[in-house]
Interface confidence: medium
Amino acid sequence: SIPWNLERITPPRYRADEYQPPDGGSLVEVYLLDTSIQSDHREIEGRVMVTDFENVPEEDGTRFHRQASKCDSHGTHLAGVVSGRDAGVAKGASMRSLRVLNCQGKGTVSGTLIGLEFIRKSQLVQPVGPLVVLLPLAGGYSRVLNAACQRLARAGVVLVTAAGNFRDDACLYSPASAPEVITVGATNAQDQPVTLGTLGTNFGRCVDLFAPGEDIIGASSDCSTCFVSQSGTSQAAAHVAGIAAMMLSAEPELTLAELRQRLIHFSAKDVINEAWFPEDQRVLTPNLVAALPPSTHGAGWQLFCRTVWSAHSGPTRMATAVARCAPDEELLSCSSFSRSGKRRGERMEAQGGKLVCRAHNAFGGEGVYAIARCCLLPQANCSVHTAPPAEASMGTRVHCHQQGHVLTGCSSHWEVEDLGTHKPPVLRPRGQPNQCVGHREASIHASCCHAPGLECKVKEHGIPAPQEQVTVACEEGWTLTGCSALPGTSHVLGAYAVDNTCVVRSRDVSTTGSTSEGAVTAVAICCRSRHLAQASQELQGSTSGSGLNDIFEAQKIEWHEHHHHHH
Amino acid sequence: QEDEDGDYEELVLALRSEEDGLAEAPEHGTTATFHRCAKDPWRLPGTYVVVLKEETHLSQSERTARRLQAQAARRGYLTKILHVFHGLLPGFLVKMSGDLLELALKLPHVDYIEEDSSVFAQ
């Protein structure tokens, strides 16, 4: 049988066929910034080019003995996970290694920066196909390391990094906290977050997704045919780097934003036991385990969206939190969430020529989160329409009045500290789907977009008595773009999207003791793009033999048993 | 291969202009900031990444590095430019005493300075 981790990332349809042939990822170059490696190991021989780049600090301790196999251990294993002949994810990917970690696995921010600069200069001197950079390392939060990653990402390079092994918020570490980097946490064979001694995988809003990272069989530097099991978020990141290489090889023109959205879309959803994470981090941590797409065809028509959480605003009265989408993404809706329920809603606003989502804390609140719904919508033209507080009993309304514009999201923001229980009507008038409805004391913001073939509809799920959680999901073929709550009363903690489901959270009735606040309705806006579907069908008609589909079915390989060395 | 030093005379000229009070002052209203790792054991004091404003050219980076060396020398401090960055971020990596941070933050073109720190295999 194939190792558990390779089975886990393989789409169910292909599990019986074992795994993919050795040419996956062949158009892609993966740079590895790590320890030195044993490049003549049979798993990676001829696949990894050792560059002359080396920038490492002196090893600690006077009694340290440099042993080649120990010096090469971490990097060799990861190179094997990415592109190893037998135990690799992208068996066709070629790799280049840079040494930025010493024999004790320690490096410096400055050495890593110089390494990233080296990659950029190499890319300029000799432009090749798609580049993936794997950073299986972590240090404390570093503004400069994050900035360098941002610059490299904006130059078209896909960066994948380890979330960190500190059982902590990944946002406190770099490069894990860099928004442009794909940050990967680790899960085990039971889809549980990985525990590493007293610590374990990092978590939180800075993690993009999880991947296998415990008991991963890969190349051992003990001998040229040895294998070993290793664990960590580095191993998880190596899986995602391999998957990225496969995707980019099948679709070399994918942008970073498109790749990230696809990684999220094709991940296994809601399989991680969130109880392992600290309670306050559960809602922020993506419940996603990376997997290869079943094929590239059929992905193009999809309207891809992801949820981006802001940092916590902090508790001061006028504190705000801002969530931003990536440069190539459209902000289609904005919502907010506060654990205490004390918030003053959210609004979409322009910042530097781009829409951002800003949430507002309220007096006595412990702070808020802004939640952006970020989507890939080519040729989109989006704007925000605002209606000030109506003061009328019917509540505030705003709709998309421009020809060809559809409603993708509703936000509401109020200046009063507590909206109380003044309820606007829950049901919007029939025949007006392009309308946002809100509390009469709130200003309402409608996100209105025009894009070829874009169509949207509103779905509501109302519950007569207050409940801790109300959800509504978009059906197959439709993508959730907007998620909000009706009414915006004080017992509603907020609304946010989890994959294709809109979740509205309310205060626990047992703690408030009040049931008088009435119904809560989750409002989802579900969209699809007929234009993307059409383009995809045309592409399928004219293209053959380039999808992952074809790669999988081209050849079946056997899993070779080797003598395994375990730590 | 780069020769950062250009002309040695420039160092002496920079020194003189400092003494004459002619040194270029940082742009008004912009204050460079200092950052360091929140995890104390991971800090590497004595080595600093000086990040310059986005549109700074390589020649300006080199000039700023030389100016720092000249101003530090006047105060009896040695500085060692370990690397000049260009391609991703403009700036330079410098080995120097932490006593010079205040001075370095006032240099023209400086956006922020970050103390070097450790990273670890995960």
Partner: antibody, heavy 121, light 107 residues
């Protein structure tokens, strides 16, 4: 132990080039700057230049700027100094030296054994 | 360039003598001065760094002093193995420069 081992003696004709190597052992090569210093027969020491730990940054004595190239190959822990357009007054012993940085001080703590280069027609 | 003028260029002394070598910089080099010892056919060896700090393993009879432009290397009690040539070096600014050397010979 920490040492720098240089390549053997060279005899060159005027106008030719010479490339001297300096192999490091006993320490992490990429942690230290390497300097090159020469000494003409019966004369004092003359600093030629330096190459930083990652080989990405060099500084030269203006006197040699147009003729000297300094490189390093981290995979074999070796630094190189190439001097072109040789003249008879380039006849000297060429040393590589490791620069050690300690707090606010630095100095050459380890020297190679020297490479004699003779330029003669 | 900063010129380091070393004096004397040579001196004769006996075992047990106190020997003083001076080095004068053409401009302020603060304390960025090192002293090296070189024996015939050998490479230089570091004795003193930052004007007055004795390098690891260097006997205590060697000491350095000075700052700014005037520097001194003192051997308090000359030993047979100390007969060699001594060089001062400034590393305050580029290009690094050395003194002309002082040859210490047996009287």
């Amino acid at each position: 132990q920490v040492q720098l081992v240089q390549s053997g003696a060279e005899v060159k004709k005027p106008g030719a080039s010479v490339k001297v190597s300096c192999k490091a052992s006993g320490y992490t090569f990429t942690g230290y700057t390497i300097h090159w210093v020469r000494q003409a027969p019966g004369q004092g020491l003359e600093w030629m230049g330096e190459i930083n730990p990652s080989g990405t940054y060099t500084k030269f004595n203006q006197k040699f700027k147009d003729r000297v190239t300094m490189t390093r190959d981290t995979s074999i822990s070796t630094a190189y100094m190439e001097l072109s357009r040789l003249r008879s007054d380039d006849t000297a012993v060429y040393y590589c030296a490791r620069e050690r940085i300690y707090s606010n001080y630095w100095f050459f703590d380890v020297w190679g054994q020297g490479t004699t280069v003779t330029v003669s027609s | 360039d900063i010129v380091m003028t070393q004096s004397p260029s040579s001196l004769s002394a006996s075992v047990g003598d106190r020997v003083t070598i001076t080095c004068k910089a053409s401009q302020n080099v603060y304390t960025a001065v090192a002293w090296y010892q070189q024996k015939p056919g050998k490479s230089p060896k570091l004795l003193i760094y930052s004007a007055s700090n004795r390098y690891t393993g260097v006997p205590s009879r060697f000491s350095g002093s000075g700052s700014g432009t005037d520097f001194t290397l003192t051997i308090s009690s000359l030993q047979p193995e100390d007969f060699a040539t001594y060089f001062c070096q400034q590393y305050s600014s580029y290009p690094y420069t050395f003194g002309g050397g002082t040859k210490v010979e047996i009287k």
